[in-house]
């Protein structure tokens, strides 16, 4: 807490700027104006304060608005928001993706901090869902922000949200995950033309029950063997040796250099000889 | 930079119990998704269970109501209690912590089931 003491004569501020940097602590309190302050948040960020004297500058902001800051605040903290705890987070009602996305940019390329932990999670509350644009911008500063997500949590992101998703913010999730995700995508994407849709639904695949990938099997959608590895075992065993064949297409020759891992073992153990042999492959059950 | 640190390991009977630790150190805030995977020799690594941020757990078929993940938050630990073990168990099992930005893998702990 910082003592109140009298503005010396000729050091009040008319306005934010480089000149505060030499003012010690108790004349920033006595000499700048809380309200002056909120209005030229911009500029704070442009000028080399220390963290004692952005102490300070946030002291002012929190007796200015004790019930928490405006949007039009927030959305210029800049690196003042580091300052913030998750407490005074959750005073706030931040509505605009204009103003999560400058927060976010504050800690870009860092781990999740708790404050940017509970900025999101007010975010997400206050828009009553996880909807396209959001996820968008989550995902682009934090990849693995879906597959951070409990299944129940996903339940609730709406099918059109998922065409924000690209491949690479599956790869942390697990099968729980994709489980509760590909159906979502299923709805998403399912005004798609065949090759179109097998693209987009690819990364889901790792959810898909047995009847969409025989029904994938009759589309000549060529499966590679990574994607074909991360399908539920439980999705594959009761396919056909044909259904494999057309699921996979050019690739089913890679099955003899998987053939000891899951899914291909088991499912390999579920096949008549007969079948295997077809193959060509030297598969043995 | 975060740690983990499996241990708890070993050689047991079928039917028997191990219940295994993933010390982590480090700091890592927000969501946090600590899952176990497993790799025995020559195959590749899959997927056991995961404990989510929420408190929720998932588990792979294979494991499902023999296994049981836990964590103590306090501890920055997470556990894989394995109960009536069988061969097919045997692997080395790992630890991973997920966050948004990050995924952070341990070194893995041996675990042996003899019939």
């Known amino acids: 807490e910082v003592e109140k003491t009298a503005c010396p004569s000729g050091k009040k501020a008319p306005e934010i700027d480089e000149s505060l940097i030499f003012y010690k602590k108790w004349e920033l309190e006595a000499c700048v104006d809380a309200a002056l302050l909120a209005t030229q948040m911009d500029r704070v960020n442009a000028i080399p304060f220390t963290y004692e004297q952005l102490d300070v500058l946030k002291h002012k902001l929190d007796e200015l608005y004790p019930q928490g800051y405006p949007e039009s605040v927030i959305q210029h903290l800049g690196y003042l928001f580091l300052k913030m705890s998750p407490e005074d987070i959750r005073k706030w009602n931040v509505t605009s993706l204009e103003t999560l996305k400058a927060l976010l940019e504050v800690n870009k390329g860092h781990e999740m901090s708790p404050q940017v932990a509970t900025l999101i999670d007010r975010f997400v509350k206050g828009r009553g869902q996880l909807d396209k644009d959001t996820l968008d911008t989550l995902t682009a500063f934090y990849p693995g922000y879906l597959c951070s997500l409990s299944p129940e949590e996903l339940s609730s992101v709406p099918p059109s949200s998922i065409w924000a998703v690209r491949p690479q913010d599956l790869d942390t999730c697990d099968p729980r995950q994709l489980d509760v995700l590909y159906p979502k995508a299923r709805l998403a994407f399912q005004n798609m033309n065949g090759s179109e849709y097998f693209v987009k639904i690819q990364s889901f695949l790792g959810g898909a029950p047995t009847e969409d990938l025989k029904a994938l099997s009759q589309q000549n959608v060529s499966m590679d063997l990574a994607t074909f590895m991360k399908l539920r075992t439980d999705a594959v065993l009761p396919l056909t040796v044909a259904e494999v064949q057309k699921l996979l297409g050019p690739h089913v020759e890679g099955l003899k250099a998987e053939e000891r891992h899951r899914p291909v073992r088991d499912w390999i153990l579920r096949q008549r000889q007969d079948d295997l042999d077809t193959l060509g492959l030297g598969l043995q059950g | 930079q975060v740690q983990l640190v499996e241990s708890g390991g070993g050689l047991v009977q079928a039917g028997g119990s191990l219940r295994l630790s993933c010390a982590a150190s480090?700091?890592?805030?927000?969501?946090?998704?600590m899952r176990w995977y497993r790799q025995a020799q020559g195959k590749q690594r899959e997927w056991v269970a995961s404990?989510?941020?929420?408190?929720?757990?998932s588990y792979s078929d294979p494991v499902q109501g023999r296994f049981t993940i836990s964590r103590d938050n306090a501890r920055n630990t997470v556990y894989l209690q394995m109960n009536s073990l069988r061969p097919a168990d045997t692997a080395v099992y790992y630890c991973?912590?997920?966050?948004?930005?990050?995924?952070?893998w341990g070194q893995g702990t041996q675990v042996t089931v003899s019939s």
């Open positions: 991973n912590l997920g966050t948004a930005l990050s995924s952070y």
């Open positions: 480090g700091s890592t805030f927000g969501r946090i998704v």
């Open positions: 404990i989510y941020d929420s408190g929720s757990t």
